[in-house]
Interface confidence: medium
């Protein structure tokens, strides 16, 4: 009965330690300059020149709001967002019929409270390089 | 040609409201965010906030919530600022000016309007 | 807010002097400073964007330099038309501020 009781308190500790790491990825602390303010909640960085580079991130906090500069690497994945990572595997065998192959991609870091899907699927075509490379590189890692 | 244009000097009593419009041309009028700036008598410049045209998305300078509302008529390129519950403080040349994402700076300014406020 | 600390507060000068302005940020404002000019009863005028950049149509003996929280903003040779107040601002974060200005006057 003892022991039951333990593993009741510690799921629900486990519960609540979710929750606030949960509640925590919504909203970033970071009191703006000269701020009072201490839970602020920062929208995704917007570059100034279409996909990646020096931007601006806008950020609430009650009825304050804030801009300042962000960076989005250049080497994301653009197609995505900036703001979402993935690791993808390797890619799979060449579909005949479609003349493609893809690969999945699984979430591997968000920025502050981006919008991204857990996993993504990727296809391109394969010529016949890339054809005799797969038969070649079978088992090998990235592409 | 880049234009953006103010009205003329306002002169209002204590505890009243002004609109004062900025109306942009020569350009597309939702490119750019449109940003105040207040100039007191013999001072320096304070940025009051700035509004996007797009979503109307305002950002404003925590020293003017509450005294400044910006808003924006698309259909006339139009860029409004309303000042409200005006004080002596308030006296000053208002101005506008434009800026993007892609050219953080006020690379534009309307001629400035000059708001008295006396009794 | 970044506060910007501008020197000097008044300059007179010679026409053909060379003149620096400082500009100092509380913080770090990366590169993310501009420059204007206003002359008497006029709107302020863009001339230094992104603290070195010269804006279109602005004769290039006005330069900017600096990184991080010291700036400096140059005349090269004055000349009389040059008679104006010249201000520092920083972009880099809500609420942009500037520099408390600086009025030239020329002999």
């Known amino acids: 009965m003892q022991h039951r009781g333990f593993l009741l308190l510690t799921l629900l500790a486990l519960l609540a330690l979710t929750s606030a790491v949960a509640k925590k990825k919504d909203k970033v602390k970071k009191g703006g300059p000269g701020s009072e303010c201490a839970e602020w909640a920062w929208g995704p960085c917007t570059p100034s020149s279409k996909d990646c580079g020096v931007g601006f991130r806008e950020g609430t906090c009650g009825a304050q709001t804030q801009r300042i500069r962000c960076r989005v690497p250049c080497n994301w994945k653009k197609e995505f967002g900036a703001d979402c990572k993935y690791k993808f595997e390797n890619w799979g065998a060449c579909d005949g019929g479609t003349g493609t192959k893809v690969r999945q991609g699984t979430l591997k870091k968000a920025r502050y409270n981006a919008q991204c899907q857990e996993t993504i699927r990727v296809t391109k075509p394969c010529t016949p390089k890339t054809k005799a490379k797969a038969k070649a590189k079978k088992g090998k890692g990235k592409d | 040609e880049v234009q953006l244009q103010q009205s003329g000097p306002e002169l209002v009593k204590p505890g009243a409201s002004v609109k004062i419009p900025c109306k942009a041309s020569?350009?597309?009028?939702?490119?750019?965010?449109m940003g105040w700036v207040k100039q007191s008598h013999g001072k320096s410049l304070e940025w009051i906030g700035d509004i996007n045209p797009n979503n109307g998305g305002t950002i404003y300078n925590q020293k003017f919530k509450g005294k400044a509302t910006l808003t924006v008529d698309k259909s006339s390129s139009t860029a409004y600022m309303e000042l409200r519950s005006l004080t002596s403080e308030d006296t000053a040349v208002y101005y506008c000016?434009?800026?993007?994402?892609?050219?953080?700076?006020?690379?534009?300014w309307g001629q400035g309007t000059t708001l008295t406020v006396s009794s | 807010s970044i506060v910007m600390t501008q020197t000097p507060n008044f300059l007179l000068v010679s026409a053909g002097d060379r003149v620096t302005i400082t500009c100092k940020a509380s913080q770090s404002v990366s590169n993310d400073v501009s420059w204007y000019q206003q002359k008497p009863g006029q709107s302020p005028k863009l001339l230094i964007y992104?603290?070195?950049n010269l804006y279109t149509g602005v004769p290039d003996r006005f330069t900017g330099s600096g990184y991080g929280t010291d700036f400096t903003f140059t005349i090269s040779t004055v000349q009389a038309e040059d008679l104006a107040v010249y201000f520092c601002?920083?972009?880099?974060?809500?609420?942009?501020?500037f520099g408390g200005g600086t009025k030239l006057e020329i002999k």
């Open positions: 000016a434009r800026w993007s994402y892609s050219n953080p700076y006020f690379d534009y």
């Open positions: 992104y603290a070195s």
């Open positions: 020569g350009y597309t009028f939702t490119d750019y965010n």
């Open positions: 601002q920083q972009d880099y974060s809500s609420p942009w501020t």
